[in-house]
Amino acid sequence: QVSKVPSSISQEQSRQDAIYQNLTQLKAAVGELSEKSKLQEIYQELTQLKAAVGELPEKSKLQEIYQELTRLKAAVGELPEKSKLQEIYQELTWLKAAVGELPEKSKMQEIYQELTRLKAAVGELPEKSKQQEIYQELTRLKAAVGELPEKSKQQEIYQELTRLKAAVGELPEKSKQQEIYQELTQLKAAVERLCHPCPWEWTFFQGNCYFMSNSQRNWHDSITACKEVGAQLVVIKSAEEQNFLQLQSSRSNRFTWMGLSDLNQEGTWQWVDGSPLLPSFKQYWNRGEPNNVGEEDCAEFSGNGWNDDKCNLAKFWICKKSAASCSRDEEQFLSPAPATPNPPPA
């Protein structure tokens, strides 16, 4: 059974999101220390953006936006040439669409306007200088801060960020980067005391952790790959979970195995945990599916819905496991560990 994540996570989501957002954008700024005036402009935008994000509800929708912003951040950090800003604009286009679906549109509009101005500011920055070490460190920290369950810990992180932000704003010269390293050291120490409901590279959604593979395996080997990391080829339990996973798969333009097949009895679809496919879930099959053409006995995410395909074919896969509870008694305040890599191809 899925273990519940403490309610403090949802209660403090706004604060987490502000922190997470601040880190993400700050990371992009750190890579560009040579123009103080531009950085100051970015910090002003961040302040407004942080305030807007902090007030917003709709955790699940906002998480989509934060994931997009993370990708935007990566694009900015890795692509200094202006000609390559097209990727950033594509991210913003998707973000704008996501914003359009959310309640409190006035607030969302505010976020979008801030992002537009931020994008413009970033687009004018010179090529990134040699801040690679800082950049990589912040990448790790950003991932860690994504799921902060305790208010006191959040406050500590927030204070560290404030000091770090101030330090960066005052440091147009490379010679003064020692101060940034000191701030990072403190920030890292604070992060390492936090609980992490999901391993690195996994995505948290409604009390569970999901791993989207970057390699391909057949259906049976995908089951094995998930077991090897203490998880299960994904079993879908709710409409919300289905929508989340379908979006992940379709937006990555991938065909992705799920833990559903009719291998045991033709025409009787069953999840890998032994539970039957409920009638209410049959709506997710694509038109004309499942058709069992050529012994198609395993289910995949395909486009806007599900398809049955041959189990021997290599596709991407999604693993699922319960998020860690954040009790100190359970000794789960562990130092961050590297992401579990994809198992080698079969």
């Epitope: 391909q216 395996r217 057949n218 379709s250 333009n253 991938r254 065909f255 992705t256 694509n286 038109r287 004309g288 599916e289 050529g294 012994e295 395909s302 486009g303 806007n304 819905g305 398809n307 395909d309 041959k310 021997n312 074919l313 290599a314 596709k315 991407f316 191809p345 079969a346």
Partner: antibody, heavy 119, light 112 residues
């Protein structure tokens, strides 16, 4: 890395059956459909069909159902295409291709086998 | 069968120029799963074709960002923002939504 190595150029008389091969390496052979594409001199590309090396299921373009037979030898990770009763219309370069089921694309192509049919 | 028609047949360009190739299908090529399996392949002189774009607008791994695809339904376009020498060759559109899968007749990108 994925490699598809095709057999060398062949010349055959009209009516004499011909078989060309494609040896795959660098990946799990039975986990991807293998297909064939025809390119006549100075012309475009035509999809002939594909075969699943796992169970030898083949799906053919109806235009080639009486022309092409696809087979597989799992032990050598090789797929074959036999062309029956070839005519000058069958003179072409034939490519074997891998259909990637994770993206639904032809992500790897062999170097091509040139078939010349003449008397 | 779905007929894929490309234009122009030949496209003379100077290096550094923009280039645009059109592909029109004889019927809508949206798959039953809601996606559109429209791909673009480049065949350089003396070589095998190579995948550039899949699902209308997604660059395949390793493809430079000067290549972009767009379109929907029956009309699709491949654009090259600034042509480089390695881009010369024949471009083919391909639909994998309806069996039999079909290629366009090709567009030859060549130097003026």
């Amino acid at each position: 890395q994925v490699q598809l190595q095709q057999s060398g150029p062949q010349s055959v008389r009209p009516g004499a059956s011909v078989k060309i091969s494609c040896k795959a390496s660098g990946y799990s052979f039975t986990s991807y459909w293998m297909g064939w594409v025809k390119q006549r001199p100075g012309q475009g590309l035509e999809w002939i069909g594909m075969i699943d090396p796992f169970d030898s299921e083949s799906r053919l373009n109806q235009e080639f159902k009486d022309k092409a037979t696809l087979t597989v030898d799992k032990s050598s990770s090789t797929v074959y295409m036999q062309l029956s009763s070839p005519t000058s219309e069958d003179s072409a370069i034939y490519y074997c291709v891998r259909r990637n089921g994770g993206y639904y694309v032809f992500d790897s192509w062999g170097q091509g086998t040139t078939l010349t049919v003449s008397s | 069968d779905v007929l894929m028609t490309q234009s122009p047949l030949s496209l003379p360009v100077s290096l550094g120029d923009k280039a645009s190739i059109s592909c029109r299908s004889s019927q809508n090529i949206v798959h039953s799963n809601g996606d559109t399996y429209l791909e673009w392949y480049l065949q350089r002189p003396g070589q095998s074709p190579k995948l550039l774009i899949f699902k209308v607008s997604n660059r395949f791994s390793g493809v430079p960002d000067r290549f972009s695809g767009s379109g929907s339904g029956t009309d699709f376009i491949l654009k090259i923002s600034r042509v480089e020498a390695e881009d010369l060759g024949v471009y083919y559109c391909f639909q994998g939504s309806h069996v039999p899968w079909t290629f366009g007749g090709g567009t030859k990108l060549e130097i003026k």
